[in-house]
Structure formats: structure tokens, C-alpha cells
Amino acid sequence: SIPWNLERITPPRYRADEYQPPDGGSLVEVYLLDTSIQSDHREIEGRVMVTDFENVPEEDGTRFHRQASKCDSHGTHLAGVVSGRDAGVAKGASMRSLRVLNCQGKGTVSGTLIGLEFIRKSQLVQPVGPLVVLLPLAGGYSRVLNAACQRLARAGVVLVTAAGNFRDDACLYSPASAPEVITVGATNAQDQPVTLGTLGTNFGRCVDLFAPGEDIIGASSDCSTCFVSQSGTSQAAAHVAGIAAMMLSAEPELTLAELRQRLIHFSAKDVINEAWFPEDQRVLTPNLVAALPPSTHGAGWQLFCRTVWSAHSGPTRMATAVARCAPDEELLSCSSFSRSGKRRGERMEAQGGKLVCRAHNAFGGEGVYAIARCCLLPQANCSVHTAPPAEASMGTRVHCHQQGHVLTGCSSHWEVEDLGTHKPPVLRPRGQPNQCVGHREASIHASCCHAPGLECKVKEHGIPAPQEQVTVACEEGWTLTGCSALPGTSHVLGAYAVDNTCVVRSRDVSTTGSTSEGAVTAVAICCRSRHLAQASQELQ
Amino acid sequence: QEDEDGDYEELVLALRSEEDGLAEAPEHGTTATFHRCAKDPWRLPGTYVVVLKEETHLSQSERTARRLQAQAARRGYLTKILHVFHGLLPGFLVKMSGDLLELALKLPHVDYIEEDSSVFAQ
């Protein structure tokens, strides 16, 4: 029978008695930076080329005895998970291994850097097809390791890394915290986050997605035909490296941004039991389990978006938090969230020639998050239109006035500390979907975009009685680009997008009276691109 | 541990040279920063990655590394350049005393310095 992990990542249409999806990643080369490996294991024989690269520290302890099978165990297993004949994800992928971890599974940041440099030089000397680099290791936060990963990613290499097995915020570890790297957490057969001894998978905003990482049967270095179960975020990352190899083999021109968006899009949504994560990390941690796309082609028509959370701003009065999209992505909307509810909103602003999303803390607030909605929108021309606070009692409003520009997101930012506490709610005038409406004391920012065939619509869901959470989702074929709360709901903690659903969170309802001020309205902006759909049909 | 003495035999005791002047003092207003792992047991003091500014050429990296060795030698310190980076990041890996960090941070082209640290199989 198919091992549980391969079944989990396989779309139903591929599920047969044997796991044999089309095209096994044969156009892709996967580099593995790990322990030494047993390259003559029947699972990976002829598939893995052991490079002459080795940079490892001495083993600790005077009584340590090097035993080949122990030295090779981690790397052999991972090579098998990526491309193994029987238990591999991308059975056609070829691999190259670099030894950066010693027999105890320990390495150094400097050794890893030199390994990444070796890959870059190899790429320059002999350019091949798409490259995936698997980094099944973690250390403390390292500016230099993250910088090296960024450079390699900008050279067109896809880096996949383990989130870490420390049951902690992945942002505290490297390379997991590097934004350019695809960071993978681990789940088990019950779609629970993996527990490992007293610890377990890392979590948080630096994790891109999860993948099977417990009780994974793969090649064992004990003998050339042996198999063994291993667990960890390394195993999870190896699944995603294999999926990435499959996707890149089917579409070799995919950029890192496109690949990441596809990985997110085709993941299983909302299957992880979030109760395992610390309460303050649940909203930040993606509830996504990686899966292969149902077909290798035809995803190009979709408008892909993802949600990017900033680091926490910290509690000082003027503290701000910034969320950024990847270089190839467009920032289509910006929202903010504060657990205390004390915030001064958010705004989109230019930074280094690119739009970023900045959230503002308020006096007495415990801090804010900025939430960017980052999308793939080819040939897009986006700008931000701002209206300063209005004098009129009807509130502030701004719309997209340029010909052919559509509204993709609304943000509002205010200087007064407790906006809306004593003010009547502002009602959105009906029949004006292409504008953002806000409090008269807030400046309102509209994200307006022009792109071939782009069309957007506003969708609202209001609840008259107070509720801790109000949601509104975009229907099939439409993608959520903007998520905000209708002004006038003073107890709103913030708004954010989860997959294709706009979530507006409010303070604990027990503290709020059920007056009209208790009303909460979630506003979603849903878009689609007819141009992308047509282009896709023409290809087929 | 057995290799340690051997390693130090190879260390270069660089002599004072014409390169040890102030011809390329760091630009005004830019201060290089020092970083180290927040998890103490994972720190590897004595080995440092010196990261140079983005557009630094390989020849400048080598020259900066030699300058560090020369200036360290004048103060009676042994240093060893373990690797010169180019291709991804400009810089070099150096084995030296932590006492020399202040000196290294003032070298021309230096963006930041990071103490080496451990990484682990996950």
C-alpha cells in the first residue's frame, strides 16, 4: 500500500495502487546540504551524485566512534524521500549531495555558507535546468546565512528548508527565517503538528507551509536495501523539495514567487489542529499541508495571492510594523491587527521603489502586525490613492479614478488614539464599489491596479450582534485581494486574509454591548484575471 | 581537539606592510555591526564571517583580509583566513581572537561581522 505520507501529498486523481504521478521531476537538479550519504542504496543508486564538497566540524566527545551507517543516516533518508525509487516524491529528480553536517548531525553556519557558494559557482560554471536546494538544518538566527540564501534565491535557485524541531517560532532560526526560502513545518498522519520528544515542529509567520514529517519510511543507511522511519521538519522539507521538483519539471520557467504561490494554492487548507500551537502564534501560522497540483499544467490562469505577516511592532507608542511582498509580487492590499485592539491603522507606502504595508501601534497598545496581501499579477501597474481626513460627517472616501484601474484593497490610518469610540458608525453608500470609505478622522488609502483583464468586486458580510469573528469569502474562480472592516466598529482588533476568506476579529464580545456599535462588517475585495484565463486556454 | 596545534602552526604572522595604512578608511557615518547567535551553547567564538559591502570585488576582499592580518600582527595576534567568499557574498572567514573585533569592524568595506555558530540536522 502507498505510505501515508505519499498518499497525503497526492491529489485523488493520481491515487492508484502505486504512487506514480506523471513526470518525476527529471528536468530538475536537487542539491542536498546534509550529512554524508550512502549513494549505493538501492533507493537512490544512480540518482544521487556525491560532490567532493565537505565542510564539517569535528565530532564532539572523545568517545565518539564514527560508524558509517550513523554518519549517513540523515542524508540517505532525505535523498530517498526526495527521489527514492519506491518511497520518493520526485522519482525522476537527480540529486547532488554536499556534506555540511558531521556524524552527529552538526555543522556550522560558515560551512553552510561555503556550501551555498559552491552551488552558486557550479551553477555559473555549468548552467543546467531549474535548481532546488534542500537545507534540512537549522541554527540560531543568522543574518549572514539569511543573506546568502537571499542572494542564491535571487539567482533563480529555489531553496527549501526545515522550519526546525524546537517547538518554537521559526523566525528565531536560520535559514528558516529567510523570507526568500520556502520554510516547511511538519505534520503527522492525523494532520497534527509533529511532536518530537519534549519538542516538535516550529511554527509562526516564517513558516510557509507544512508537509508530512512524522513516521516517514525511507532509505536506511544500515544496508543497501534497508528502510527506516525518520521524523522531523527535514523530512517535511524533503517532501516539499520533491513537490517543487515535480512542478518545475512540468513548468521549468516558474519563478520562485510563482512556485511558492502554487505550493500554497495547491495545499490542503485548514486541516491542522491549531490548538497545538501557542495561542499567540495561531493566527500567524499557515494552516496549509503541501500537496502536488492535480494536474501539471493549466494553473496559469489563476490569480494567485498569499498573506504575509510582519514581525510584531513592539509596544512603544510610535512603533510600526512592516510587511513586504517578494520582488516579483504585487502588494494588492494592506491591513493590520492588534490583540489589544489599540492600533492606528495601516497604510501602503513606497520603500525602495516598491510598495510595503506599514501598521501603526497606538498609545497603550501591546503592538501591531502589518498584513500584506501579495499577488502574482503580470503586467500590473498599481498605485495608492490617498484621501486625507475629511471634515464632512459622512466620513473619508477615496476611489480609483484612473481609467482602467480597479480597486484591489482599502486601508485606513489615523492619528487620534481611539478612533470611533464615541462616534457613530459610517455607512458605506451603496452602489459605489470602486471606493474605500472610512472615518472622517482617518486618512484612507485605496490600492488601484491596472492589469490586462483584471476585474474586481466588493463583497460584504455584516453581523448586527457583536461576534468575535466575522468572515466573508470569495467564490470559486475569484481570488481575495483585499480584506478590511467597515468603519464604525470600534472594537475591531483588525482584519486579515486566510486563504480566500477575509477575517475580521473583534474584542471579546462579553465586554461589548450589543448596540449598533457592536455591528461588525467584513469587506472582501475579490478579483480575477480574464487575461490569464484566456492565455491559459490558448496554450491548451 | 587533536588538530588544534597543527592549525595554529599554519597561522600567518603577517608583518607590517604598506597596506596597513589608512588609505581605505571606512566611509563616514557607516558603522559596521557585530552579530552573534542568541543561543549561547550554539556559539563558536574564535571564528568570524566578515561580510563586506555588496559591490566589493574579490581583490578588495583579499586585500581587506590581508590588512586585518597585518593589523592584528602588529598587536601581537595570530589570525588565519580560512576562506574568502565571492560569488554569493563578498567577505572572508577568519579564525582570530574576539579581542580583534573592534579593529575588524573599522576595516574598509566591512558591512557587518558575524560570529560563527552551529547548525543541526532537523
Epitope: 543516516s73 524541531n165 518530537l196 536506511s220 536495501t225 528502510f227 | -
Partner: antibody, heavy 130, light 107 residues
Framework: EVQLVESGGGLVQPGGSLRLSCAAS????????MSWVRQAPGKGLEWVAN????????YYVDSVKGRFTISRDIAKNSLYLQMNSLRAEDTAVYYC???????????????????????WGQGTTVTVSS | DIQMTQSPSTLSASVGDRVTITCRAS??????LAWYQQKPGKAPKLLIY???SLESGVPSRFSGSGSGTEFTLTISSLQPDDFATYYC?????????FGQGTKLEIK
């Protein structure tokens, strides 16, 4: 279907020897630790011994150390228990079982995470009596 | 060696009842605990591993909890098929010990 089938049980005199076998089918035999567990008539379960995937590590309950030897033949998908110097208190039904567990890395250490015995044979009876 | 003590030794209950069996370890075993069900003349069957993880194919009325030294097996609504003997088992450094068993019988 995953199956374990024990054989080799029987009546033996105290001080005698027996060799139990366990044939595995439908499982990747070499992927798992394997155990022998026994159950004396009317009593509870007692773990006897286990062996690593490649046979390189073996562990025994104190009462059988030096008398029993666990081994495996990966090529034959078989597990064995050689029992010497048998005593009356060794009388029991002997089960072979698959130990399900997983390895994971800690900070510079390689650890085993045990789940439980998820596949069992039907048992073979050993009677030690004069 | 770590000793495992199960209580009660015998438990009488009726179909539909919620029953709890306790297992105590003589020293901390973290979550290294499994629960088994055994019917007369049959081999044991794994129900719960890692103290609280349900083995695949086992009905969801079975649940496990606890860590350290105190563990419980709960059957939320007893079914006729559940009358059997239940064993807990600890794992420590590649050696195992079982509890003495709890016989669950019809009241």
C-alpha cells in the same frame, strides 16, 4: 496484508533448548525494530527481547539475559528467538511483534521515538516441563 | 527498572458507560506510553501510542491522556466489543514494561 506467523513452539524439558521463528509478509521487514513478547497462562504480557532493523542492537529483559538470543534474517524476512537453559517459568505463549517507532535528530543527537507494537503474530506455545 | 501499575485490576461496566483506566509509572516516562486491548486467545491490539495518539482503524471512542507518571485510557461510550483486558506499556531506552492489565467485564 501485513502478517506475522510464529512457529517452533512445543514441549521441552527444563534445561533444554528451542528456536522460535517468525515469518513476516506484507511489511517492509527491514524498516522496523522487532520484539518477542510472552504471556504465561492466565497472566499478563511480558516483553522478552527486541532487535534493531539491521540486527546491530539487541535488548533483553533481565530474566532471560544470557539464555535467550534474538536474531533476524533480512533476506528471509524472518525473526528468531533462540532459547537455551529453559526453565518452567519460561512457559508461555510467545508472540512476535513489530515495534513501530521513528528516529529523529535532537541537538547533535539521534533519538528513537517509540510508538508501540502495531502488528502481532498469533503466538506459539512453549511449555517447559519434565 | 520502571514499574507500571494499572488500576483497577477489574472493572465492571455496562454498554454505553464512560470508563477510565489509570496507569502509573514508577518514574517519569514523558509520553512514551501505549495502550493495548487483548481478547481471550487472541494477540494484543495497539489502541493508543505516544500516550494520546489514536492508532489508525481504532474507533474514536478510545482516547488516551497524561504525561510524566500518570496516564489514562478512556472509552467514552462502551460497546459490546470493548469487553476485554487492557494493558499499558512504557518504553524507556529500548526496554519495555507492561502494566499487569485491567479486565473490563460486563456488569
Amino acid at each position: 496484508e501485513v502478517q506475522l506467523v510464529e512457529s517452533g513452539g512445543g514441549l521441552v524439558q527444563p534445561g533444554g533448548s528451542l528456536r522460535l521463528s517468525c515469518a513476516a509478509s506484507g511489511i517492509t521487514f527491514s524498516s522496523y525494530w522487532m520484539s518477542w513478547v510472552r504471556q504465561a497462562p492466565g497472566k499478563g504480557l511480558e516483553w522478552v527481547a527486541n532487535i534493531k532493523q539491521d540486527g546491530s542492537e539487541k535488548y533483553y529483559v533481565d530474566s532471560v539475559k544470557g539464555r535467550f538470543t534474538i536474531s533476524r534474517d533480512i533476506a528471509k524476512n524472518s525473526l528468531y528467538l533462540q532459547m537455551n537453559s529453559l526453565r518452567a517459568e519460561d512457559t508461555a505463549v510467545y508472540y512476535c511483534a513489530r515495534d513501530r517507532g521513528t528516529y529523529y535528530y535532537g541537538i547533535g543527537s539521534y533519538n528513537y521515538y517509540y510508538y508501540g507494537m502495531d502488528v502481532w503474530g498469533q503466538g506459539t506455545t512453549v511449555t517447559v516441563s519434565s | 527498572d520502571i514499574q507500571m501499575t494499572q488500576s483497577p485490576s477489574t472493572l465492571s461496566a455496562s454498554v454505553g458507560d464512560r470508563v477510565t483506566i489509570t496507569c502509573r509509572a514508577s518514574q517519569s516516562i514523558s509520553s512514551w506510553l501505549a495502550w493495548y486491548q487483548q481478547k481471550p486467545g487472541k494477540a494484543p491490539k495497539l489502541l493508543i501510542y505516544k500516550a494520546s495518539s489514536l492508532e489508525s482503524g481504532v474507533p474514536s471512542r478510545f482516547s488516551g491522556s497524561g504525561s510524566g507518571t500518570e496516564f489514562t485510557l478512556t472509552i467514552s461510550s462502551l460497546q459490546p466489543d470493548d469487553f476485554a483486558t487492557y494493558y499499558c506499556q512504557q518504553y524507556n531506552s529500548y526496554s519495555y514494561t507492561f502494566g499487569q492489565g485491567t479486565k473490563l467485564e460486563i456488569k
